[in-house]
């Protein structure tokens, strides 16, 4: 699945709006990391165009933020790029997602730095 | 100040093309959600389509799915909509209409004065 | 036939109160919010309510939106002759996946 900026042609909803989200997910990425979230809509069938929120501010997608269907990537974090972030119907600005974003400053352990 | 200025409008014949254009000035286009609403004579509004900002989205009515095209430049803060095999009953008068805020709950908040397609042999 | 339905028309004398209703079903209006549009003749619709009962700015609070289960309403009070104009209902369908309006209600000031 890609992610991108580029257009995509929606057809026909499968659903109308499922249950409220659960409480917030905390995540904890390094700095320089690519933060990714994911949400996919209740019921798994399409519910008009989303747009995700940081901190109240709609995002729009750019070369760093890259938006994909029920996805959401931005690359090389820094701690500005902490907060809180929700995947919302556009429409209703019903929350479908909801994230708190941690970004430290020490890049993440997930790559093996032992090989000194 | 908002302002949306539609043009490209005109006469076409049955089976021709034509694309109108939306010039948007007065806010930060790129961040906004854009529609084209048509009204044909004495008639009442149908939305045509819109593209959605915050997803990529783009979505159409079903009268004109696989005929119109509806696209934005961001750089030169302009909204396009492309229609192919145009038919009698695409003549009407349309409308780009901005939506509100990404961040709020949606509704079309400016219109254009409207440009007038007439599709007739 | 439009997927929203209003009726074609309404009237009022000045200072009166009027409500033009906009019916609708669960793929919409039920599980969605309405807006309402004034068009005054030879010109663009103008927002008038959004999200079932909000006003934008610079819109008289004689002018008033409801919402119950799949129907919404509008409702302006102490009518004006420049209240005449056609009125449209919106709101997004679910089920056709895009914006659906109403018919629209000519409102005429007797």
């Known amino acids: 699945e890609s992610l991108g900026t580029e257009q995509r042609v929606v057809g026909r909803a499968a659903e109308v709006p499922g249950p409220e989200p659960g409480q917030q997910e905390q995540l904890v990425f390094g700095s320089g990391d690519a933060v990714e979230l994911s949400c996919p809509p209740p019921g798994g069938g399409p519910m008009g165009p989303t747009v995700w929120v940081k901190d109240g501010t709609g995002l729009v997608p750019s070369e760093r933020v890259l938006v994909g269907p029920q996805r959401l990537q931005v690359l090389n974090a820094s701690h500005e790029d902490s907060g809180a972030y929700s995947c919302r119907q556009r429409l209703t600005q019903r929350v479908l997602c909801h994230f708190s974003v941690r970004v430290t400053d020490a890049p993440s352990s997930g790559d093996d730095e032992d090989g000194e | 100040e908002v302002q949306l200025l539609e043009s490209g409008g005109g006469l076409v014949q049955p089976g021709g093309s034509l694309r109108l254009s939306c010039a948007a000035s007065g806010f930060t286009f790129s961040s906004y959600d854009m529609s084209w609403v048509r009204q044909a004579p004495g008639k009442g509004l149908e939305w045509v389509s819109g593209i959605y900002s915050g997803d990529g989205s783009i979505y159409y009515a079903d009268s004109v799915k696989g005929r119109f095209t509806i696209s934005r430049d961001n750089s030169k803060n302009t909204l396009y909509l492309q229609m192919n095999s145009l038919r009698a009953e695409d003549t009407a008068v349309y409308y780009c209409?901005?939506?509100?805020?990404?961040?709020?709950?949606?509704?079309?908040?400016?219109w254009g004065q409207g440009t007038l397609v007439t599709v007739s042999s | 036939q439009s997927v929203l339905t209003q009726p074609p028309s309404a009237s009022g004398t000045p200072g009166q109160r009027v409500t033009i209703s906009c019916s609708g079903s669960s793929s919409n209006i039920g599980n969605n919010y309405v807006s309402w549009y004034q068009q005054l003749p030879g010109t663009a619709p103008k927002l008038l309510i959004y999200?079932?009962?909000k006003r934008p700015s610079g819109v008289p609070d004689r002018f008033s939106g409801s919402k119950s289960g799949t129907s919404a309403s509008l409702a302006i009070s102490g009518l004006r002759s420049e209240d005449e104009a056609d009125y449209y209902c919106?709101?997004?369908?679910?089920?056709?996946?895009?914006?659906?309006f109403g018919g629209g209600t000519k409102l005429t000031v007797l």
């Open positions: 999200a079932d009962s």
């Open positions: 919106a709101s997004w369908d679910y089920s056709l996946s895009g914006y659906v």
């Open positions: 209409a901005k939506d509100g805020p990404m961040n709020e709950i949606s509704r079309f908040d400016y």
